[in-house]
């Protein structure tokens, strides 16, 4: 039984995966920071967790992954002030009891420490010194990422 | 309705502690991060600290630094504010405000509690 | 930390009149200014987020105006109601701040 934010979760990448062929992204847009091999989007409006899922869909782009400790760190160092809180693409899922990355993926427990309790309807959000686990239907920012890249996409067929 | 009723104001001699409380009611209290203001008497509004909706994240004010703590109880739909160490200029009547992260404003607030730091 | 001034610090006026106060920001704070009134012994009130934007169940009287560093609260027919102290707030960076408000009185 997955979780209204789960299912929106997966319906979003879905429809992501079944987007046509397009070239990969040289450079940033308008706006989009630039951080290593991604552009990122800091949003300066507010949502819940769910409706910034869906607007990075908008942007064809999603909710920002984070790979590693170095990855949050230059991504924390992009945040102007210390109260302000952005949503990440990270939720708790109940079925599996565990924090999941918006693609699938699990959180491997040395990549971030997060601050707060792990259980339903609970999202991850980003400072610009911490990880705190928040109730999903909070408003606060959000961060979207591009992949930077110049190969094409991989195109996966519609089932 | 949304309402918010703090509580746990009064005199204390100064170095001493007082505990406010404020009640939270009419809306999703840990979807909200929360705020205390002050003001001093015949002056104006100054933000005293913040924490987030979960209570994982906090900030202050320098004036607060290190003799406040905000804190909250999501289970009770209650926010604290510890004051130890307290000063005369600490004297204020303490408001509870709904909002406090950016670039949230504060959209409800309590009716206030008076506290008084005098000898 | 940013500073907010407020011009004037009272005026007398009458109903009916139109009232307009001015912030001014020591820095760019884009559209992150709020507008409060404050009424004698009660807990201030928002009418006003995010330069002009108007809280729900606030009369219509009231508006708000500007970007960067200079805004402005606007009364466009003054009513016995509005009698009452008037703050201007940041929330663009930490710590929040408040002007030092503006007192509307009966002239």
């Known amino acids: 039984q997955k979780s209204s934010i789960e299912k929106c979760s997966v319906d979003i990448q879905q429809s992501r995966n079944k987007t046509t062929e397009r070239p990969g992204l040289l450079n940033c847009p308008i706006y989009w920071q630039q951080l290593r091999e991604k552009c990122l989007l800091f949003s300066h409006t507010v949502n819940p967790w769910n409706n910034s899922l869906a607007d990075c869909s908008t942007k064809e782009s999603s909710l920002l992954l984070i790979r590693d400790k170095d990855e949050l760190i230059h991504t924390q160092n992009l945040i102007r002030d210390k109260a302000i809180l952005f949503w990440i693409g990270l939720n708790f899922s109940l079925s599996e009891k565990n924090w999941k990355w918006i693609n699938g993926s699990f959180l491997n427990s040395n990549d971030l420490e997060i601050r707060g309790d792990a259980k339903e309807n609970s999202c991850i959000s980003i400072s610009q010194t911490s990880v705190y686990s928040e109730y999903c239907s909070t408003e606060i920012r959000w961060i979207c990422q591009k992949e930077l890249t110049p190969v094409r996409n991989k195109v996966y067929p519609d089932s | 309705e949304v309402q918010l009723v703090e509580s746990g104001g009064g005199l204390v001699q100064p170095g001493g502690s007082l505990r406010l409380s404020c009640a939270a009611s009419?809306?999703?209290?840990?979807?909200?991060?929360m705020s205390w203001v002050r003001q001093a008497p015949g002056k104006g509004l100054e933000w005293v600290s913040a924490?987030?909706?979960?209570?994982?994240?906090?900030y202050y004010a320098d004036s607060a630094k290190g003799r406040f703590t905000i804190s909250r109880d999501n289970s009770k739909n209650t926010l604290y504010l510890q004051m130890n160490s307290l000063r005369a200029e600490d004297t204020a009547v303490y408001y509870c405000?709904?909002?406090?992260?950016?670039?949230?404003?504060?959209?409800?607030w309590g009716r206030g509690t008076l506290v008084t730091v005098s000898s | 930390d940013i500073q907010m001034t407020q011009s004037p610090s009272s005026l007398s006026a009458s109903v009916g009149d139109r009232v307009t106060i001015t912030c001014w920001a020591s820095?760019?704070?884009?559209?992150?200014l709020n507008w409060y009134q404050q009424e004698p012994g009660k807990a201030p009130k928002l009418l006003i987020y995010?330069?002009?934007s108007l809280q729900s169940g606030v009369p219509s009287r009231f508006s708000g105006s500007g970007s960067g560093t200079d805004f402005t609260l606007t009364i466009s027919s003054l009513q016995p109601e509005d009698f009452a102290t008037y703050y201007c707030?940041?929330?663009?960076?930490?710590?929040?701040?408040f002007g030092q408000g503006t007192k509307v009185e009966i002239k």
């Open positions: 405000a709904r909002g406090g992260y950016l670039p949230d404003a504060f959209d409800y």
């Open positions: 009419g809306f999703t209290f840990s979807s909200y991060a």
């Open positions: 924490t987030s909706g979960s209570g994982g994240s906090t």
């Open positions: 820095q760019s704070i884009s559209s992150y």
């Open positions: 995010a330069a002009s």
């Open positions: 707030q940041q929330t663009y960076s930490t710590p929040l701040t």
